[in-house]
């Protein structure tokens, strides 16, 4: 229940945050499964416990396994599992499936690509880029906080896009690199007020308490490629990753579809394992662009188990 | 919607035991903690232990800890707590109770609706 | 185990006052939680976490403190604030509560 997965580099940093949640007050212990040996704390080891994070400065193949993290509350030890797994750096360009993150969409107007899983690691910008193994240069690549905007994308920008940084521990400097695709949607067009298309305003959608459940936020903004335009989740007013609920999450990127000729965005929240909880709190689905915002209000409901008879 | 119903008024006399029963519905019964905490007439609050149903595991208040045992049925989504050699002082209303939250501890956020135990003689 | 204070035993306001309930606690703890009780009703939630209010509560209610020293604050008492008002800590087991507050309603 309280497990993920992590893959990284030999030779590249890795931090894997703990599943489990708790208190930043709480003391985190760290086990190698196999073995049950503690990691250790202090920061001169290679592998090294830090709180809620576990940190492989730098990482090797042979650190691949299941860690297991326990936070240690005032009443109980909880605990989680980490599945890491650590790769041999590639001697051609190709990058493996198994170690792309998800791919992400964009268009003529609308071109950023985030780097994954960035948040974990102390960094400083610029982001270094790549794309097909090609350091980007040239006025149309902006590396943008933790994204790349690609300027006046073409159909050409497709690709696999490499970013990275360089992780920084205590003076010591670590590289960190992350791959994710890139497709390109392009068509020429006009945009419009936002218009969502799902969900419905002031919508009631019936969910299974302890079962997940995903919110699809969906939009057009026009025909063709659309500059400027989001959909993005809110709970309760504030922005998903601000709330603070690590079971409520926003896909990824946006996935960009044109149906009927009309360029729309599409943003999933996904509900892990839905608490009763979770039906207090407003979902707001936002759509916007320079027209301006539009918001349809969602909230959920139990679903009440069907009766079958025979 | 998350609800805890616990089990009717019980009157015991001195030195026998009382098993107070708590019944959760609307939430994942095995995700969440079950605390008991317990409030003798015109008193403040008392937290006496808690219970993880998962596995079974408990935490009591030293203050309790000879005399109660917290239990939990995964099947019926119910909790118990029985505290033996019971003493005029015991007389209390017992209530269950869990967090919002579980692994953030923020809190009682949902209570039963308690249950008044009279020790008399 | 950690001891909760709490201050002053009784308040006694008129409706719109500002009410101002201290809890203090025998070592320093990271977050205080706060619940009302009226009679025979079980405690309600108000604040968690020092400061952050609980579903379903007013806006007039809120918290702040660290360390030994934590505060509930009503802005603007209504008469239905008429209760008593326990501070709680989750930082050590066992787990306690202050003596509680009682509120008046003049």
């Known amino acids: 229940k309280f497990s993920k997965q992590s893959w990284g580099l030999e030779n590249e940093a890795l931090i894997v945050r703990c599943p489990r949640q708790g208190k930043p007050s709480y003391t985190v212990d760290w086990y190698y499964s196999q073995t049950n040996k503690s990691i250790p704390t202090q920061e001169r080891n290679r592998v090294f416990a830090s709180g809620q994070l576990l940190k492989f400065l730098p990482a090797a193949v042979a650190d691949s396994g299941i860690y297991t993290c326990i936070v240690r509350s005032p009443t109980f030890n909880r605990t989680g599992y980490a599945n890491v797994t650590i790769y041999k750096k590639q001697s051609d360009c190709n990058v493996p499936d198994y170690l792309m993150y998800s791919t992400v969409s964009g268009s003529e107007k609308n071109s950023k690509i985030y780097c994954p899983t960035i948040d974990l690691y102390n960094w400083t910008a610029p982001l270094e880029w790549f794309k097909n193994c090609q350091a980007l240069q040239g006025s149309r690549y902006r590396a943008h906080k933790s994204f790349l905007v690609i300027d006046n994308v073409m159909t050409e920008d497709a690709g696999d896009y490499t970013c990275k940084f360089i992780h920084n521990e205590n003076g010591a400097n670590y590289s960190v690199t992350a791959t994710r695709s890139f497709t390109v949607k392009d068509e020429q067009g006009f945009s419009l007020f936002p218009v969502i298309g799902a969900p419905a305003q002031n919508e009631i959608k019936e969910v299974e308490i302890g079962k997940n459940a995903n919110l699809t936020c969906s939009a057009c903004f026009g025909k063709g490629t659309q500059f400027l335009a989001a959909v993005l989740w809110q709970l309760n007013g504030t922005k998903i990753t601000d709330f603070g609920e690590p079971r409520i999450q926003q896909e990824e990127g946006q996935n960009q579809s044109f149906s009927n000729g009309l360029a729309c965005l599409d943003m999933v929240l996904r509900i892990a394992d839905v608490k009763e909880e979770d039906l207090l709190l407003q979902y707001d689905c936002l759509a916007l662009n320079l027209h301006g915002l539009r918001r349809h209000t969602v909230r959920l409901s139990r679903k009440n188990p069907i009766d079958h008879h025979s | 919607q998350v609800q805890l119903v616990q089990s009717g008024a019980e009157v015991k006399k001195p030195g026998a035991s009382v098993k107070v029963s708590c019944k959760a519905s609307?939430?994942?019964?095995?995700?969440?903690?079950l605390h008991w905490v317990r409030q003798a007439p015109g008193q403040g609050l008392e937290w006496m232990g808690t219970?993880?149903?998962?596995?079974?595991?408990?935490v009591y208040n030293q203050k309790f800890k000879a005399r109660v045992t917290m239990t939990a049925d995964k099947s019926t989504s119910t909790a118990y707590m029985e505290l033996s050699s019971l003493r005029s002082e015991d007389t209390a209303v017992y209530y269950c109770t869990r967090a919002f939250y579980n692994d953030y501890d923020d809190g009682f956020a949902y209570w039963g609706q308690g249950t008044l135990v009279t020790v008399s003689s | 185990e950690i001891v909760m204070t709490q201050s002053p035993a009784t308040l006694s306001l008129s409706p719109g006052e500002r009410a101002t309930l201290s809890c203090s606690v025998s070592?320093?703890?990271?977050?205080m939680h706060w619940y009302q009780q009226k009679p025979g009703q079980a405690p309600r939630r108000l604040i968690y976490d020092t400061s952050k209010l609980a579903s379903g509560i007013p806006a007039r209610f809120s918290g702040s403190g660290s360390g030994t020293d934590y505060t509930l604050t009503i802005s603007s008492l209504e008469p239905e604030d008429a209760a008593v008002y326990y501070c709680?800590?989750?930082?050590?087991?066992?787990?306690?509560f202050g003596g509680g507050t009682k509120v008046e309603i003049k």
């Open positions: 070592s320093s703890v990271s977050y």
């Open positions: 709680q800590q989750w930082n050590t087991s066992p787990l306690t």
């Open positions: 219970i993880d149903p998962e596995t079974g595991d408990t």
């Open positions: 609307g939430y994942t019964f095995t995700d969440y903690e």
